[in-house]
């Protein structure tokens, strides 16, 4: 004979756990239904009555099957240095990421809490390590024989052009100037660019207040615990 399918609420067999999308209610001592994503518990189960769920209100959400009495509040609107990559819905939180030319200096569980502009290497310095979504540009002084004459978060140090006759020797921030109109060897015209990270598609010209050689600052924050009851026993 096939086993009877138990309908919630039901008392679990000793030593067994509740089924998928159910939770064990310690007060009722029963397996009760969870609420689906986008909902929350409006009335908890009793020994003979199952959980009653209700939709999350505007600007609140639940992402997992849950039995929380209140939906979670969506994060605040994205700031001017961010773009909203995921909208707040009843089933998901708003996600803000840094706009091009910025990186995430302080992350949160999803998205970014605090964006900062990518460092720009001033003339005489080039990009040693490009910026990413979560790390700043690292600048380095141009080595002898190389230069950078731009203030940029993407330009690397380029070799000086090699002249038959040097009019003005190159330095870290200026290319060599040749007397003859055709140097024996030169770089292709235009600045050499590093590949840009996803979040750095446009350039900004404001100089950084700190020295260009300042090391990139990392922020490490512990992740907070997941919300209670929400999905604490999985789907």
């Amino acid at each position: 004979l096939p086993a009877q399918v138990a309908f919630t609420p039901y008392a679990p067999e000793p030593g067994s756990t509740c089924r998928l999308r159910e939770y064990y209610d310690q007060t009722a001592q029963m397996c009760c239904s969870k609420c689906s994503p986008g909902q929350h518990a409006k009335v908890f189960c009793t020994k003979t009555s199952d959980t009653v769920c209700d939709s999350c209100e505007d600007s609140t959400y639940t992402q997992l099957w849950n039995w929380v009495p209140e939906c979670l509040s969506c994060g605040s609107r994205c700031s001017s240095d961010q773009v909203e990559t995921q909208a707040c819905t009843r089933e998901q939180n708003r996600i803000c990421t840094c706009r091009p030319g910025w990186y995430c200096a302080l992350s949160k569980q999803e998205g970014c809490r605090l964006c900062a502009p990518l460092r720009k290497c001033r003339p005489g310095f080039g990009v040693a390590r490009p910026g990413t979504e979560t790390s700043d540009v690292v600048c380095k002084p141009c080595a002898p024989g190389t230069f950078s004459n731009t203030t940029s978060s993407t330009d690397i140090c380029r070799p000086h052009q090699i002249c038959n006759v040097v009019a003005i020797p190159g330095n870290a921030s200026m290319d060599a100037v040749c007397t003859s109109t055709s140097p024996t060897r030169s770089m292709a015209p235009g600045a050499v660019h590093l590949p840009q990270p996803v979040s750095t598609r446009s350039q900004h010209t404001q100089p950084t207040p700190e020295p260009s050689t300042a090391p990139s600052t990392s922020f490490l924050l512990p992740m907070g615990p997941s919300p209670p009851a929400e999905g604490s026993t999985g789907d």
Epitope: T27, A41, K42, V43, F44, T46, V52, P228
Partner: antibody
Amino acid sequence: QVTLKESGPGILQPSQTLSLTCSFSGFSLNTFGLGVGWIRQPSGKGLEWLTHIWWNDDKYYNPALKSRLTISRDTSENLVFLKIANVDTADTATYYCARIEGLRRFDYWGQGTTLTVSS
Amino acid sequence: DIQMTQSPSSLSASLGGKVTITCKTSQDINKFIAWYQHKPGKGPRLLIHYTSTLQPGIPSRFSGSGSGRDYSFSISDLEPEDIATYYCLQYANLWAFGGGTKLEIK
């Protein structure tokens, strides 16, 4: 406006049975998700949850007192009753009834009725 | 049964000041904690539920926080009418109150 009011004998002798009544208005025990419970406070001590009854007649009891407690209701008259058998001086307390809503919080309380158990 | 340890049992503070009361539970209660204000001759009054949600009509001077087994309740900008005994209540596994905190004003 939700109100609850407790009534009881005031004084009992040890071994007698305590009968308390909670009369309420502003809500109905026929309303899905609502219940009425009893909490007591011995003089100079903290609050102690005793029992409550839900709209669907499900009952919950404090395990330490379960054998002595009986809760019942009259939905048509908006009454909830509590009986405590075999009272002792330790049962001397102020007894409160309170409404409990579907998320299990006691949100409205009566002013309490005092019981003294003395021989 | 879940045990509730509320502290301090009494405290005295100045008008306009701030006080904090804590409740520790014997097991994780998933934020299912409420806070009540109790004045003599009256029934307790629900101030906060689900750790930090203020009941309608309760001033924002009252606040709650916590998770797991550790919870706290604060009153800022103390006023004379705040003189009362305050209780925590866990409702994750049946119901159990803390021992109470009697608040006095200096």
